[in-house]
Amino acid sequence: EPCVEVVPNITYQCMELNFYKIPDNLPFSTKNLDLSFNPLRHLGSYSFFSFPELQVLDLSRCEIQTIEDGAYQSLSHLSTLILTGNPIQSLALGAFSGLSSLQKLVAVETNLASLENFPIGHLKTLKELNVAHNLIQSFKLPEYFSNLTNLEHLDLSSNKIQSIYCTDLRVLHQMPLLNLSLDLSLNPMNFIQPGAFKEIRLHKLTLRNNFDSLNVMKTCIQGLAGLEVHRLVLGEFRNEGNLEKFDKSALEGLCNLTIEEFRLAYLDYYLDDIIDLFNCLTNVSSFSLVSVTIERVKDFSYNFGWQHLELVNCKFGQFPTLKLKSLKRLTFTSNKGGNAFSEVDLPSLEFLDLSRNGLSFKGCCSQSDFGTTSLKYLDLSFNGVITMSSNFLGLEQLEHLDFQHSNLKQMSEFSVFLSLRNLIYLDISHTHTRVAFNGIFNGLSSLEVLKMAGNSFQENFLPDIFTELRNLTFLDLSQCQLEQLSPTAFNSLSSLQVLNMSHNNFFSLDTFPYKCLNSLQVLDYSLNHIMTSKKQELQHFPSSLAFLNLTQNDFACTCEHQSFLQWIKDQRQLLVEVERMECATPSDKQGMPVLSLNITCQMNK
Amino acid sequence: QKQYWVCNSSDASISYTYCDKMQYPISINVNPCIELKRSKGLLHIFYIPRRDLKQLYFNLYITVNTMNLPKRKEVICRGSDDDYSFCRALKGETVNTTISFSFKGIKFSKGKYKCVVEAISGSPEEMLFCLEFVILHQPNSN
């Protein structure tokens, strides 16, 4: 069975084809080759000499036991080599020779017992080394690591490392890898020698499910003293053994580290006193809790010095009391409990993401809700009922506003967005908004993107509601049940580049409403019920138009519409997916491609 | 279509068939077997995925006695610092994991419950596997 040609001459997918040897019938120019799940078993010298241009080579689960010297010789352009799941028993010293451009080496679950005799010291270009799920017992980074000056990611998770000694990291003292991210999760650690990490700088350190008791966790974290880390991730996994006990003593040792960003990811334990618990983390710039349960929600009003707070997928008794002077970014998403939003006091806040919480807002939105006048980004998408009772007074700095898939009330009772002259992006898609007031978008003089799909209009008619949106470049009006539009609805949108009118209910096509859209490049009218043109003679669309989508409509392919069908053929160079433009009537032409029709009409009057 | 038996409990019998062409082997054990009236136990899965599990989610299509429920999407792996350790599993890496579950207080009517589980992962998104579970429910007190 032949390989699948994904991109001609470039990418070939040969997965699970029962190959015992490397195929020789693929082009020399192949750059991406997936040979995974084939019983190759043995890689001899110059195994891939037929593919000198290879950049990505996937050999996952190929039952490879032996890799000889120079197996990859000639692959000087290879940047990614994947060896996951091969039971390697014999790895020659020169197994990886010739890989002068290799940036990513994945040797997950390959029976690797030690880094010491892993022959990769010459791979100077290596950026990512993943040796997770192996049998490595020692964390000693071999001397050859001093050659790997570009290394940015080292994944040692799911190995057998129990202890870390001062000598293990000596090579990092000689040659500090300032950008190194290190993942040691799922190693059964019980000892970190104090001073082992002294004066070590890491970009990121991840330690999840490493400790089988609170005491071990406590002493190991104390053993990290002196480490300077940009981002520290601690925590557990839901499907692994979890700590039976967790209290403030666990994290006391963090006072002896220099941490820029901290994240606690999953803890099967109720956090009650977060002030004491995170006492050593009051001055990190970014603080993040993922998948934890928080009992006392008042604690977030303590004077933490955080600039970014992230609470994701957590459980709360009620919406937390948030009073944080220095906070600039708050991400509070996919949380449970506390369904009603309560006011927060965050005077420095610029970015607020409150999406996917099922929250309801009794009154939205003004400065008093968020305790700030600096807000530039506000995401309230995928929530519950949001009642618009104020038009963003004090929030005039807003540039990005997202309400999609929340239930907006009172949207047509006043000019909700009147204050937002700096707003660039607005998404009110699928918000149950019924447009019954022409001033709905008044004030949005800087708006560039407006998404309002899945809403409705009074009498299914689009009126002149966009008159002030002179900078608009993207407008989505899909799924709005529209049947008619004002001929002047788009007259002020001279900058508009993309207009989506798909999935509405137009019976006819008219070019007239688009005559002023001098910048229009994409017009999507797919999934309507267009049968013919509104007027017998259709004018041209703006000359800027590059893509016109008329697929999945109800074209009436009869003589009386000959001029419209001819006009469609004349637009052929603009049309996308022409094979999905089919006749709906009459019954003998149903399903025929419109462009293949040859309608010759006898005008017998 | 070959049917794979999972387990029997006092009020349910659970089996599955593949609903994709590939039928890559997957081993599923539930201990103790699920009782629909109330259940607590461990789900053990052994599987070698044909693509990375990053951003794994399930589409669930549930049928209750021929009545179709709306499609549900259950996100398992968001993509970074996920709850489950198998979210970091790579294509070709052995996934051998035990997940605890519990639910209570749901009353099910007697009959045949079908659940099509479409597992989708990776970027670009592609189907990982598709299993159709059949649960025959015989409530012993209803």
Epitope: E459, N460, Q481, E483, N505, F507, L527, H529, D554 | -
Partner: nanobody
Amino acid sequence: EVQLVESGGGLVQAGGSLRLSCVASGRTLSTVNMGWFRQAPGKERDIVARISPSSVSTYYSESVKGRFTISRDNAKNTVYLQMNSLRPEDTAVYYCVADSPGGRSYEYWGQGTQVTVSS
């Protein structure tokens, strides 16, 4: 399941009028397009008229423009076709059609009602 039942057909002299009715049952169709097709002996079935949910948009085939009027009463789940100035070439079986609530065109069909125009 949606059922469409037409009525009002019959024999009429050229120049006369008829009013066809179509009642939908099984679910409300107030949010979908409805219309009328016809099929004359030996000819293909083709659309005559169509009306949008709010009645804002209507479509008529060229041959009936100015003579036929489509209308609907959403409260009664009914669509009508008023046919004036009938001609012998209007003789056909007239079918009521409705789109699906999901937006698929011409999803539901009635059994048809015979209209015969004699000269």
